[in-house]
């Protein structure tokens, strides 16, 4: 049985390809899924010579490898696109690369929002 999972209802949303895909560029996404299925947030990005290029953020459908992850942490060594998922509202705001081979942990903080 599932125990103590953080319910995910909303995630940070971002789409680098927003113009072509005719979506919003950024904001919040309310997660919708089938009854009895868990929902997650995710982030995906590229790292070109230390420069982080955000690809997408948003809601992610029930995926067992995302269960009970409170933080969004990618562990692949050097993929074309980094991916992480997590549970809990807006848990994909920050995302981290913690390579399995024991390289340095790199956490990406969102830029501060401008005062309104």
């Amino acid at each position: 049985s599932g125990r103590g999972e953080a319910e995910t209802r909303e995630c940070i949303y971002y789409n680098a390809n927003w113009e072509l895909e005719r979506t919003n560029q950024s904001g919040l996404e309310r997660c919708e899924g089938e009854q009895d299925k868990r929902l997650h947030c995710y982030a995906s990005w590229r790292n070109s010579s230390g420069t982080i290029e955000l690809v997408k953020k948003g809601c992610w459908l029930d995926d067992f490898n995302c269960y009970d992850r409170q933080e969004c942490v990618a562990t692949e060594e050097n993929p074309q696109v980094y991916f992480c998922c997590c549970e809990g509202n807006f848990c994909n705001e920050r995302f981290t690369h913690l390579p399995e081979a024991g390289g340095p942990e790199v956490t990406y903080e969102p830029p501060p929002t401008a005062p309104t």
């Epitope: 125990r3 999972e5 459908l61 995926d63 067992f64 490898n65 009970d68 991916f83």
Partner: antibody
Framework: EVQLLESGGGLVQPGGSLRLSCAAS????????MSWVRQAPGKGLEWVSG????????YYTDSVKGRFTVSRDNSRNTLYLQMNSLRAEDTAVYYC???????????WGQGTLVTVSS | QTVVTQEPSFSVSPGGTVTLTCGFN?????????PSWYQQTPGQAPRTLIY???TRSSGVPDRFSGSILGNKAALTITGAQADDESDYYC??????????FGGGTKLTVLG
Amino acid sequence: EVQLLESGGGLVQPGGSLRLSCAASGFTFRNYAMSWVRQAPGKGLEWVSGISVTGGSTYYTDSVKGRFTVSRDNSRNTLYLQMNSLRAEDTAVYYCAKVYYSSFFDYWGQGTLVTVSS
Amino acid sequence: QTVVTQEPSFSVSPGGTVTLTCGFNSGSVSTSYYPSWYQQTPGQAPRTLIYNTNTRSSGVPDRFSGSILGNKAALTITGAQADDESDYYCVLYMGSGIWVFGGGTKLTVLG
């Protein structure tokens, strides 16, 4: 290189117990959900149980609920399946499998045979 | 009780093309079930072929491809070879920590 090595299988009488282990190496065990899958002699594959990265969420196929318990020790890189009240129909090769994103089994062990017979 | 159905057996000539399917009794298979396919030869552990509907696992030849055909997941083998003779299993992830395997398809390569 990812390796999953099951152990603990053997011959047990109906009603008896066994504890299977799966020793993982070649990847960071704590970062991945894990699962047990079995195959009765001459039959197809059957999913048995799954456990999340922390061990906080565990799931079972209906036929083993209340009899089998899956657990993991992330400090020892080991997955376990405690099997109680064993029945003849639990006779199978038991495989442990690593779960990857998109909920699929990307690596499998070679399996350990459990025989339940009097 | 969810039942995942596959053709029990299938035959193909060497060099031919075969499509194995995977459906279930509760509706249509979609990408949200993350269909995956596994090959197994007698006495061996399963080998992962296709995951997330249509992504080939590393080292799998491009003769193997996955798709959704109508309301089923499908595995297509083009240019079948003798060593493709195996059992093939599909798996659907039903969500909430539950997977269901199909009964498997025994593929025979004729000749």
